[in-house]
């Protein structure tokens, strides 16, 4: 009785259970009543990452420097090339097909999380007691200066963009 289902790493064709080709190899010929599945290794710059019955291997991804990309991990016959972005840039998607410049946090905002090759800068508004007076991809919100610890008094209140201005205490006459 011909099989209707096959074991793991097999596929059904012409009422035969044929072995799938292992990762890194492509199908050249299905198995028959007389022969085992015939597979061949993927060529240079090609890969297949699963047990498969593909007649063509996939091309390795090209990390295009014109798009700000560089190779993070070279592909093998079983894995695709992994691209990442040049310093100061990050991927626009999970597939990392192009890069954009890391965003800077405007004055009044500080860096909550520094950008990586795959994620953009995350900014947060400076809360009361903190400020940022620069546009930066690295600077966090800084705490206002504590005038008291310097034996000074606040002459001008701080904002989310400016530090407090301290001055000498008025002398009692």
């Amino acid at each position: 009785e011909p099989p209707t289902a096959c074991r793991e790493k097999q596929y059904l064709i012409n009422s035969q259970c044929c072995s799938l080709c292992q990762p890194g190899q492509k199908l050249v010929s299905d198995c028959t009543e007389f022969t085992e599945t015939e597979c061949l290794p993927c060529g240079e710059s090609e890969f297949l990452d699963t047990w498969n019955r593909e007649t063509h291997c996939h091309q390795h991804k090209y990390c295009d420097p014109n798009l700000g990309l560089r190779v993070q991990q070279k592909g093998t016959s079983e894995t695709d090339t992994i691209c990442t972005c040049e310093e100061g840039w990050h991927c626009t998607s999970e597939a990392c097909e192009s890069c954009v410049l890391h965003r800077s946090c405007s004055p009044g905002f500080g860096v909550k999380q520094i950008a990586t090759g795959v994620s953009d800068t995350i900014c947060e508004p400076c809360p009361v007691g903190f400020f940022s007076n620069v546009s930066s991809a690295f600077e966090k919100c800084h705490p206002w200066t504590s005038c008291e610890t310097k034996d000074l008094v606040v002459q001008q209140a701080g904002t989310n963009k400016t530090d407090v201005v301290c001055g000498p205490q008025d002398r009692l006459r």
Epitope: N14, S15, Q16, S19, V28, S29, D30, T32, E33, F34, T35, E36, E38, T55
Partner: antibody
Framework: QVQLVQSGAEVKKPGASVKVSCKAS????????IYWVRQAPGQGLEWIGG????????NFNEKFKSRATLTVDTSISTAYMELSRLRSEDTAVYYC????????WGQGTTVTVSS | DVVMTQSPLSLPVTLGDPASISCRSS???????????LHWYQQRPGQSPNHLIY???NRFSGVPDRFSGSGSGTDFTLKISRVEAEDVGVYFC?????????FGGGTKLEIK
Amino acid sequence: QVQLVQSGAEVKKPGASVKVSCKASGYTFISYYIYWVRQAPGQGLEWIGGINPRNGGTNFNEKFKSRATLTVDTSISTAYMELSRLRSEDTAVYYCTRHGNGVYWGQGTTVTVSS
Amino acid sequence: DVVMTQSPLSLPVTLGDPASISCRSSQSLLHSNGNTYLHWYQQRPGQSPNHLIYQVSNRFSGVPDRFSGSGSGTDFTLKISRVEAEDVGVYFCSQTTHVPWTFGGGTKLEIK
């Protein structure tokens, strides 16, 4: 239905070459190997080799590797077997065959080598 | 090369009787994938060979169930439970586990 139709009988002199054709129909030609087998008069069967029409890849019986050439023309779904430097012992019926979802044979081509 | 030895060479049988043909290989035909690529053919006079059984015991579509195959390793048998007139011809075993593929010398079945 699957059919393999071979070329007609050939008479050749020793030292000559012969090219036998096998036209396939009724299935996707590139999906299955074509194999060649011969049978000398009153004798058993002898495997010559096979060719994968998808990529032209071949496998051979070492005995025939230096004299047999297997080719295909996918545009007309035809396989060819050429045997060179013929000798009298090559007198035989030559069959093409295909297997996978059943086994199919050509009708055979008689090749006679005689001076 | 793997040598396939068939016996008997000739097999005279009475119609309706059983028949048995033996095939021995010079080395095991068990493939690394677990299959055994031993097959049986029938060749009627003046015709191309016709496959009966593949991988020891699997009948091809349209082959009568009076034909059966058995065996393992190096020792194989083709049985015909009740011989009919149309069964006359030469029977070959062959192996496709090892390259080159090889055939037995044939067993001629005839009616007594």
